[in-house]
Interface confidence: medium
């Protein structure tokens, strides 16, 4: 029950995740105007991964796509590649993960196939989450460092004089978005793998213990029950479940050294 | 591309006012800055006021701030240039210009941007 709650909420935090890396990725607000030193302004810009828009004093807002792919700032196309790939990832594993939800019977599925499909869909989530964190993480990076140059630039103008001209760009409400939704994923992820490990079939098998007491012999096998700790092997090729046990009409009562009367 | 046609220029004395006007060949419907311009003899265009068709946000050099009023006509192929309390240094010749995009773009104030131009209209105001 445990492991079904895991791999459901798994799944569930994992699409909430992907639903807000797709999110994120079309968002318009990864950098936006920095409004710190002049809050009235007739004009706010912002920009995305795939366009640049302005707002006038009107509340009108203009959006221009960038229709170049070869003049665009490699950061900008690596962060492209990153929320992509991170989709890319998310959904096939939530296709996956639909198939290796325990609460649903596809055919005669068995649970070693469903533990090794929630695996797979646990580290698919994982590596997707981890490529929009690093996506943001990169674009981010790059405002940081574009911001406080454009800050030095601000105050060393010709002979000290201070040019407020130039605009400089903050984190927009998309960076925010991809870093929840790509920690969400990465939480999902984790979760599925953990679910996976109490979908796989336990490995311990205990033999029989064969008690026998018909008439005057007790028959009592000792060291018949034996607990595989995966050491030992199957030497005799039995069933692995088989462990010397008899049904009632298989033992025969030999006289041996163990037999009391 | 859309052809300007400036009109309403003039003589007039310091402390008066003017209305120019500035008809499109069309109606404008997508969006698109209309910006007038002025040059004074022996100096370099500069940018006065614009306005965004759409939405209608209006821009200002600090020199004409409070004097002078840019808005749209009705029909949406004129742009009107009102010019309140004139002095004698707005003595130039005014030319409208149009450009694809909001004047939020940047830019407005910049030549560069414009691609069509009017022939210009005469203003002089007299001391």
């Known amino acids: 029950m445990a492991v079904t709650a895991c791999q459901g909420l798994g799944f569930v935090v994992s699409l909430i995740g992907i639903a807000g890396i797709i999110a994120a990725t079309c968002m318009d607000q990864w950098s936006t105007q920095d409004l710190y030193n002049n809050p009235v302004t007739a004009v706010f810009n912002y920009q995305g991964l795939w366009r640049s828009c302005v707002r006038e004093s009107s509340g009108f807002t203009e959006c221009r796509g960038y229709f170049t792919l070869l003049g665009l700032p490699a950061m900008l196309q690596a962060v492209r590649a990153l929320m992509i790939v991170g989709i890319v990832l998310g959904a096939i594993g939530l296709l996956v993960s639909i198939f290796a939800l325990k609460c649903i019977r596809i055919g005669s599925m068995e649970d070693s196939a469903k533990a090794n499909m929630t695996l797979t869909s646990g580290i698919m989530f994982i590596v997707s989450g981890l490529c929009a964190i690093a996506g943001v993480s990169v674009f981010a990076n790059m405002l940081v460092t574009n911001f406080w140059m454009s800050t030095a630039n601000m105050y060393t103008g010709m002979g000290g004089m201070v040019q407020t001209v130039q605009t400089r760009y903050t984190f927009g409400a998309a960076l925010f978005v991809g870093w929840v939704a790509g920690g969400l994923t990465l939480i999902g992820g984790v979760m599925m793998c953990i679910a996976c490990r109490g979908l796989a079939p336990e490995e311990t098998n205990y033999k029989a213990v064969s008690y026998h007491a018909s008439g005057h012999s007790v028959a009592y096998k000792p060291g018949g029950f034996k607990a595989s700790t995966g050491f030992g092997s199957n030497t005799k090729n039995k069933k692995i479940y088989d462990g010397g046990a008899r049904t009632e009409d298989e033992v025969q009562s030999y006289p041996s050294k163990h037999d009391y009367v | 591309e859309v052809q300007l046609a400036e009109s309403g220029g003039g003589s007039v004395q310091a402390g008066g006012s003017l209305r120019l006007s500035c008809a499109a060949s069309?109606?404008?419907?997508?969006?698109?800055?209309m910006s007038w311009f002025r040059q004074a003899p022996g100096k370099e265009r500069e940018g006065v006021a614009a306005?965004?068709?759409?939405?209608?946000?209006?821009y200002y050099v600090d020199s004409v701030k409070g004097r002078f009023t840019i808005f749209q006509g009705n029909a949406g192929a004129t742009v009107y240039l009102q010019m309140n309390s004139l002095k004698p240094e707005d003595t130039a010749m005014y030319y409208c210009a149009a450009a694809e995009g909001l004047c939020g773009w940047g830019g407005w104030e910049s030549a560069v941007r414009f691609g069509s131009w009017g022939q210009g209209t005469q203003v002089t105001v007299s001391s």
């Open positions: 069309r109606y404008i419907s997508s969006s698109y800055c």
């Open positions: 306005i965004s068709t759409r939405g209608g946000s209006t």
